[in-house]
């Protein structure tokens, strides 16, 4: 928001006047002509001295009268050369020319800075015919001038394919200073110098600048526009504005807040979006960024088990999208999780810690020492194993899944058995004789089925063969054990 003082406020005598030899007024200038109103021109300057030849374009008509007297050259009459007035005032100026009556359809057009003025402009042309000539007065009026009305105005008339151009009328609209550049809000590093810029223009010129910081003037004497203020550094937020002064008064820029960059506030509302056996998806609401964009965040995870060694796992991630999946966690474990984020100044404090738990997972290892042997008397295959280590069960064991595949003469059949968690042995009926039985076992929790053990193969002979020895899980390196009985 720009505050404007009254025009009359002139705190500094800046310069004597905008143009050498020119006058100034706040009255509406009106050009008086013989057929116009009785007002005297309040502020008008003729570009030529009396008696000096006209400088505009002149058309010399070739037509002669009955007495064969050549007609005088056609030219616009001298008029005001320069009008100075205040913004929002009214102005009226005109061009006049006397045209012999032999010419028909004479029209006058108005031009500003080389462009024809068409449409919604207050231009009036009046004709005053006499015996031999018609006086034409073209008036142009602006009811409330703005800065955009500044410029050079001319009249043009076409006669006999000749163009007659008047001398220019310069309109100068004066007002309070107008900002072309105002200070901008900034976020700055504490105790570090920075610059602010302020620029304002008239007319009238010159425009002088005062800087204000937290209601105190920084410079007690004005500086010519444009002005750059070097602020030597701040320790706390400050508000800056600049005042632009000219002969018409002063305009005050918007006040801008300069903030001091600081470490961010800690994130809030850390919450669990999803838990699996080995990962937890968390989200958080970032704290205040300290007037400096977040760069990245750090997720700190520690086991909540009082018997744990208290070590903290740290996961770094980008600041967006305020979401992170923590991986490589143990199943069925409790964790404390905190989040901290950083900007260019430093790290925030850690968010309030939250408790989170991983779910049961499928065991991560297979049962150990799987042994298979044939009990020929009962026509069964006996299987034995050792349960996987508790740490790697990833949940409460609910049983085992046994896969046994029977292969004989191009026929293959897989069967699955489920057994309870108490035992560590199972018995399965022989399905096919003179065949190979391949056995694999997996531990089962509510979280799912773990990996199957390496396959153990046993050959089941035709009836009457003897079971000499068991088959067992191979030692590492023997990929495909087979025991022929």
């Amino acid at each position: 928001a720009i505050t404007e003082a009254r025009e009359e406020a002139k705190p500094y005598p800046l310069f004597p006047g905008p143009f050498p030899g020119s006058l100034q007024t706040d009255h509406t200038p009106l050009l008086s002509l013989p057929h116009a109103s009785g007002y005297q021109p309040a502020l008008m300057f003729s570009p030529t001295q009396p008696g000096r030849p006209h400088t505009g374009n002149v058309a010399i008509p070739q037509v002669t009268s009955v007495e064969s007297k050549p007609l005088p050259p056609l030219a616009f009459k001298h008029t005001v050369g320069h009008i100075i007035l205040s913004e929002h005032k009214g102005v009226k100026f005109n061009c006049s020319i006397s045209v012999p009556n032999i010419y028909q359809d004479t029209t006058i057009s108005w031009w500003k800075d080389g462009k024809e003025l068409l449409g919604a402009h207050h231009a009036i042309t009046q004709f005053y015919p006499d015996d031999e000539v018609t006086a034409i007065i073209a008036s142009f009026s602006i009811t409330s001038v703005q800065r955009s009305d500044n410029g050079s105005y001319i009249c043009k008339m076409k006669i006999n394919n000749e163009e007659i151009v008047s001398d220019p009328i310069y309109i100068e609209v004066q007002g309070l200073p107008h900002f072309t550049k105002q200070p901008e809000s900034m976020n700055v590093t504490r105790n570090t110098a920075f610059n602010l810029t302020c620029q304002a223009v008239g007319p009238p010129e010159p425009v002088n600048i005062f800087w204000v910081q937290n209601s105190s003037r920084v410079n007690e004497q004005p500086e010519k526009s444009p002005s750059v203020l070097t602020v030597p550094g701040l320790t706390e937020m400050a508000v800056f504005s600049c005042e632009a002064h000219n002969d018409k008064g002063l305009t005050v820029s918007k006040g801008v807040q300069i903030n001091i960059k600081a470490i961010p506030s800690p994130p809030t509302e850390v919450s669990i979006r999803n838990s699996t056996a080995h990962s937890i998806l968390i989200s958080w609401v970032p704290g205040f960024d300290g007037y400096s964009p977040f760069r990245n965040c750090s997720i700190q995870v520690k086991e909540a088990d009082p018997l744990s060694n208290g070590s903290v796992m740290i996961f770094n991630t980008s600041a967006l999208p305020h979401l992170y999946q923590i991986k490589q966690l143990q199943a069925l474990a409790n964790y404390s999780i905190g989040v901290s984020c950083m900007n260019e100044i430093g790290w925030s404090a850690v968010s309030p810690w939250i408790l989170a738990s991983t779910t049961e997972g499928a065991p991560s290892v297979a049962p150990l020492n799987v042994t298979v042997f044939l009990n020929e008397s009962s026509d069964n295959v006996d299987i034995r194993w050792m349960k996987p280590p508790t740490k790697q069960q990833d949940g409460e064991l609910v049983g085992y899944r046994i896969s046994h595949v029977w292969q004989s003469a191009g026929i293959s059949k897989e069967l699955l058995e489920e057994v309870g968690q108490n035992g560590s042995r199972a018995r399965i009926s022989v399905q096919v004789h003179n065949a190979t039985c391949t056995v694999r076992i997996a531990a089962v929790t509510r979280g799912g089925v773990g990996p199957f053990s390496d396959p153990v193969k046993i050959f089941i002979p035709a009836h009457g063969w003897v079971d000499y020895a068991p088959s067992s899980t191979p030692a590492p390196g023997n990929a495909d054990p087979v025991l022929i009985i």
Epitope: W211, S216, V218, Q221, T230, P232, G233
Partner: antibody, heavy 118, light 106 residues
């Protein structure tokens, strides 16, 4: 380079007047205000006020209203301090100093000792 | 008006020692300037706007502070630092100076 050169020491009787000058060089005189600072013997610095070298408008600190006048002659880039009805407690060194942004006194005159003694 | 109180008024210090001069304002100010004055000389601009060393001031000097409490620190005192130091506030008229702190070399 910027310099402020002050007039020489003055010995005055009580009730008399004195005018101290401060001639500036090396910069545009009307760009920076001129401050006046008093330092009584063995005492600290006391700001007396300043004069706007652009408009000639003086501003006086409360303790220096009345007998003290700041003036200018911009044609010779000189600021003046005039003290009338001198008193013994006016005995001091008077400094002129330029008025920069944030009231930073970047340049100082060498000081003028005014002694008031009967 | 804002009253500036410097402490100590006087300090006798051995070379290489660290020196801290404080300037406390009776109410909050935006910036504090510091000046150094030696006997029979005019004050010299020393630290501008709380923490900016003036041209030619040795880097062993530093300034800090905000609000009402400001300090001038000399990290390792040298003989040439013997002088009186004045603080001066900007932010509220009239401008005021502290009463000065005189540093003497032992």
């Amino acid at each position: 380079q910027i310099q402020l050169v002050q007039s020489g020491s003055e010995l005055k009787k009580p009730g008399a007047s004195v005018k101290v000058s401060c001639k500036a060089s090396g910069y545009t005189f009307t760009n920076y205000g001129m401050n006046w600072v008093k330092q009584a013997p063995g005492q600290g610095l006391k700001w007396m006020g300043w004069i706007n070298t652009y408009t000639g408008e003086p501003t006086y600190a409360d303790d220096f209203k009345g007998r003290f006048v700041f003036s200018l002659d911009t044609s010779v880039s000189t600021a003046y301090l005039q003290i009338s009805s001198l008193k013994a407690e006016d005995t001091a060194v008077y400094f002129c100093a330029t008025y920069g942004h944030y009231a930073w006194f970047a340049y100082w005159g060498q000081g003028t000792l005014v002694t008031v003694s009967s | 008006e804002i009253v500036l109180t410097q402490s100590p008024d006087f300090q006798s210090v051995t070379p290489k020692e660290k020196v801290t001069i404080t300037c406390r304002a009776s109410s909050s100010v935006s910036y504090m300037h510091w000046y150094q004055q030696k006997p029979d000389q005019s004050p010299k601009p020393w630290i501008k706007a709380t923490s900016n060393l003036a041209s030619g001031v040795p880097s062993r000097f530093s300034g800090s502070g905000s609000g009402t409490d400001f300090t001038l620190t000399i990290n390792s005192l040298e003989a040439e630092d013997a002088a009186t130091y004045y603080c001066q506030q900007w932010g509220t008229k009239p401008l005021t100076f502290g009463q000065g702190t005189k540093l003497e070399i032992k």
